[in-house]
Interface confidence: medium
C-alpha cells in the first residue's frame, strides 16, 4: 500500500475550463480568426461568441497554431476533452486530430507522447460531440498547449477541458541512471524509464519525470504489466548490480519548493528467483538550493527484509522531518537487480518558503519564458468525472 501516493484512477477532476474557475486571463492562443473566436471562447460546452477558438490561419501544413491553458500550479493531467465549433448547430469546424505540448516552468516544453511514442491524438468527428482522451502516460504540467491538426488546408476550431488533480507531491524532476535490460531465458525484459520527459546523457536521465512518478505500481511478476500491448518489464525501471561497483544506485529528486520530508515510499519488485530484490538499505541527504552542499550526515534506513515473499511491495523510508528542496538517495543492492515502479514522498511545504516556483532551470534552454503572475495557494474548485474515453457526455 502506497500511503500518500496519488491514485491515478481518482485523479480525474475537471480542472476548470467549463466551469470557468480557470479565468480568461489564463487562456492564451497563438492567434485568433476574430474576437468572437478568441481564446476565451475555447471552453468545453461554451456557446459564447462564435462558439469556439479558431486560429487566424490554416493549421496545415505547419501545425504551429495553439491554445494554451495555464493551470497556475503543477497538476497531473490525466485526460483531455475536445469539441469543435457548435454555434447553435451552425458551426462546422472541428479538429480530427491534435497534438499536446506541456511545460512545468514555461521555459521548457515537452511533446506529449503515448506509451508507444505516438504524438498525434484522435480528435473530433463532428462539431458538437465531446471526445475524451485518456492520457497514458499522464503529464505533470502547469501549462498545456493544444495544437490542432488537419490533413489539408481547412478551418479548424476547438473547445477543450482538462481533467486531473493537483500535483501534491511537488516533485519537479528526478535524476537516475538509465534503466537496463535483463536477459531472461525466454524473454528480454526492458527495464528502462520509457516515459521519461527529461534529458539523457552519459548514462543519466535528468531534468524530467517518468514512470517512477506516474502512479502506476508494477505487478508482482515484473514480466507482466498493468498496461495492454507493452513489452515485458514495462512497469519497472531496473538496474543490475554488475553495472554499479559502488553497490548502490544513486538518484536525485528536485521539488517545487522547500519542504519538510516525512517519508519516501518506493514500490519495489522482490521476485528474487529472477534476481530482483528489495534494496538492502537506503541513504538520503538533503539540501535547500541547487548550489548548496548536501547537509550533514545522511538519513540511513536499513531494510534487510525477508527474501521469501516474492510479491512486489512499497517500502517506507522515514526521512525524519528533514528540510530541503533537493534529495539525493542511494539505494543499496541486496541482490543482482533493483527494480522500482514508483517513488513518492510524504512532505509538507515549509510555510515561509518564498521559493514557490523553481529558479532558472539547469537544463538546456527551450522557448522563451512565459510571464507568470503569482501562484494560487489553494486548488481550484474541482468536480469529479468518471467518464470512459470516448463516452458520451
Amino acid at each position: 500500500d502506497m500511503k500518500g501516493h496519488f491514485d491515478p484512477a481518482k485523479c480525474r477532476y475537471a480542472l476548470g475550463m467549463q466551469d470557468r474557475t480557470i479565468p480568461d486571463s489564463d487562456i492564451s492562443v497563438s492567434s485568433s480568426w476574430s474576437d468572437s473566436t478568441a481564446a476565451r471562447h475555447s471552453r468545453l460546452e461554451s456557446s459564447d461568441g462564435d462558439g469556439a477558438w479558431c486560429p487566424a490561419g490554416p493549421v496545415f501544413p505547419k501545425e504551429e497554431e495553439y491554445l494554451q491553458v495555464d493551470l497556475r500550479r503543477l497538476h497531473l493531467v490525466a485526460l483531455v476533452g475536445t469539441q469543435g465549433r457548435h454555434a447553435g448547430g451552425l458551426g462546422k469546424e472541428f479538429s480530427r486530430s491534435y497534438r499536446l505540448r506541456y511545460s512545468r516552468d514555461g521555459r521548457r516544453w515537452m511533446d506529449w507522447k503515448d506509451r508507444w511514442g505516438q504524438e498525434v491524438i484522435s480528435g473530433n468527428e463532428d462539431p458538437g460531440g465531446v471526445v475524451l482522451k485518456d492520457l497514458g502516460p499522464p503529464m505533470v504540467a502547469r501549462l498545456v498547449r493544444f495544437y490542432p491538426r488537419a490533413d489539408r488546408v481547412m478551418s479548424v476550431c476547438l473547445r477543450v477541458e482538462l481533467y486531473g488533480c493537483l500535483w501534491r507531491d511537488g516533485l519537479l524532476s528526478y535524476t537516475a541512471p538509465v534503466g537496463q535490460t535483463m536477459q531472461l531465458s525466454e524473454v528480454m525484459v526492458h527495464l528502462n524509464d520509457s516515459t521519461y520527459d527529461g534529458y539523457t546523457a552519459g548514462g543519466l536521465q535528468y531534468g524530467g519525470l517518468g514512470q517512477l512518478a506516474d502512479g502506476v505500481v508494477g505487478l508482482d511478476d515484473f514480466r507482466q504489466s498493468q498496461e495492454l500491448r507493452v513489452w515485458p518489464g514495462y512497469d519497472y525501471v531496473g538496474w543490475s548490480n554488475q553495472s554499479f561497483p559502488t553497490g548502490y544506485v544513486e538518484m536525485e529528486f528536485e521539488f517545487d519548493r522547500l519542504r519538510t520530508f516525512q517519508t519516501m515510499q518506493v514500490h519495489c519488485n522482490n521476485m528474487h528467483t529472477l534476481g530482483a530484490r528489495l534494496p538492502g538499505g537506503v541513504e538520503c541527504r538533503f539540501k535547500r538550493g541547487p548550489a548548496m552542499a548536501w547537509e550533514g550526515e545522511p538519513v540511513r534506513h536499513a531494510l534487510g527484509g525477508s527474501l521469501g515473499d516474492p510479491r512486489a511491495r512499497a517500502i517506507s523510508v522515514p526521512l525524519g522531518g528533514h528540510v530541503g528542496r533537493f534529495l539525493q538517495c542511494r539505494f543499496l543492492f541486496a541482490g543482482p537487480w533493483l527494480l522500482f515502479s514508483e517513488i513518492s514522498f510524504i512532505s509538507d511545504v515549509v510555510n515561509d518558503s518564498s521559493d514557490t516556483f523553481p529558479p532558472a532551470p539547469w537544463w538546456p534552454p527551450g522557448p522563451p519564458p512565459t510571464n507568470f503572475s503569482s501562484l494560487e495557494l489553494e486548488p481550484r474548485g474541482q468536480q469529479p468525472v468518471a467518464k470512459a474515453e470516448g463516452s458520451p457526455t
Epitope: S185, L274, P336
Partner: antibody, heavy 121, light 103 residues
C-alpha cells in the same frame, strides 16, 4: 511431459560429501527456477534452497548454508545439489522440484522421484 | 521463521464423509499451498494460492483461509484420498512446510 529424473540412492560415510543430480525434460530448463527439499524420517519437509538456471541466482535456507551447494549444467538441463561434511542428521530423502513462479506466485509444481541418502559408517 | 502447525496430525475417515484439516501459521501469511504425498512417492502440488486446485485434482477438494488460519476440505471422502497433506508458505524466509496431516 515435464519430468525430473533424480540420481539413485546413496550410502555415504560420515564426513564425506556427495552430489545429487536432477535431470529435467519436457520444458525449457532455463525458464524455471529449481528448488530442493529435504524429507527426514518420511515426514518433515524442509526447503533447502533454490537456483535459477538461466541467471545463476541462488537462495538458501539459512539452516542449509554451508551444507548444500546448488549448481546447474544448462547444456544437459541438469541441476545438482552437493551435500558437504555429511552426518547422520543428513540422512533423508532429497527432492528437486520445479518452481512455478508466473504471476509472482510460487509453488513447486513438479517433483523428482527423490534421492535417498543414508549416512552411516 | 514462520511455523506451520497442522491439525489433526492423524485422522481417519469413511468414504462419503466430509474431511476438514487446518494449518495454523505463527505469523500472518498471504497465501498457502497444499501438497499431497502418498507413501513411497513424491509430494504433488494439490492446492495452490490458498484455493486454486492443481491440474487433475478432483473438485471435491477445496482450500480457504487468510492471515494465520488456513484449511483444506474434502467434501466427500474417497479411498484414493488417503494420503498425507502438507501445507507450505512462501511469505517469509525460509519457506516452511507444516508437519503434515495423515489421512
Amino acid at each position: 511431459e515435464v519430468q525430473l529424473q533424480q540420481s539413485g540412492p546413496e550410502l555415504v560415510k560420515p564426513g564425506a560429501s556427495m552430489k545429487i543430480s536432477c535431470k529435467a525434460s519436457g520444458y525449457s530448463f532455463t525458464g524455471y527456477t529449481m528448488t530442493w527439499v529435504k524429507q527426514s524420517h518420511g515426514k518433515n519437509l524442509e526447503w533447502i534452497g533454490l537456483i535459477n538456471p538461466y541467471i545463476g541466482v541462488t537462495s538458501y535456507n539459512q539452516k542449509f548454508k554451508g551444507k548444500a551447494t546448488l549448481t546447474v549444467d544448462k547444456s544437459s538441463s541438469t541441476a545438482y545439489m552437493e551435500l558437504l561434511s555429511l552426518t547422520s542428521e543428513d540422512s533423508a530423502v532429497y527432492y528437486c522440484a520445479r518452481l512455478y513462479d508466473r504471476g509472482g506466485r510460487y509453488a513447486m509444481d513438479y517433483w523428482g522421484q527423490g534421492t535417498s541418502v543414508t549416512v552411516s559408517s | 521463521q514462520i511455523v506451520l502447525t497442522q491439525s489433526p496430525a492423524i485422522m481417519s475417515a469413511s468414504p462419503g464423509e466430509k474431511v476438514p484439516m487446518t494449518c495454523s501459521a505463527s505469523s500472518s501469511v498471504s497465501f498457502m499451498h497444499w501438497y499431497q504425498q502418498k507413501s513411497g512417492t513424491s509430494p504433488k502440488r494439490w492446492i495452490y494460492d490458498t484455493s486454486k486446485l492443481a491440474s487433475g485434482v478432483p473438485a471435491r477438494f477445496s482450500g480457504s483461509g487468510s492471515g494465520t488460519s488456513y484449511s483444506l476440505t474434502i467434501s466427500n471422502m474417497e479411498a484414493e484420498d488417503a494420503a498425507t497433506y502438507y501445507c507450505q508458505q512462501w511469505n517469509s524466509d525460509p519457506w516452511t512446510f507444516g508437519g503434515g496431516s495423515k489421512l
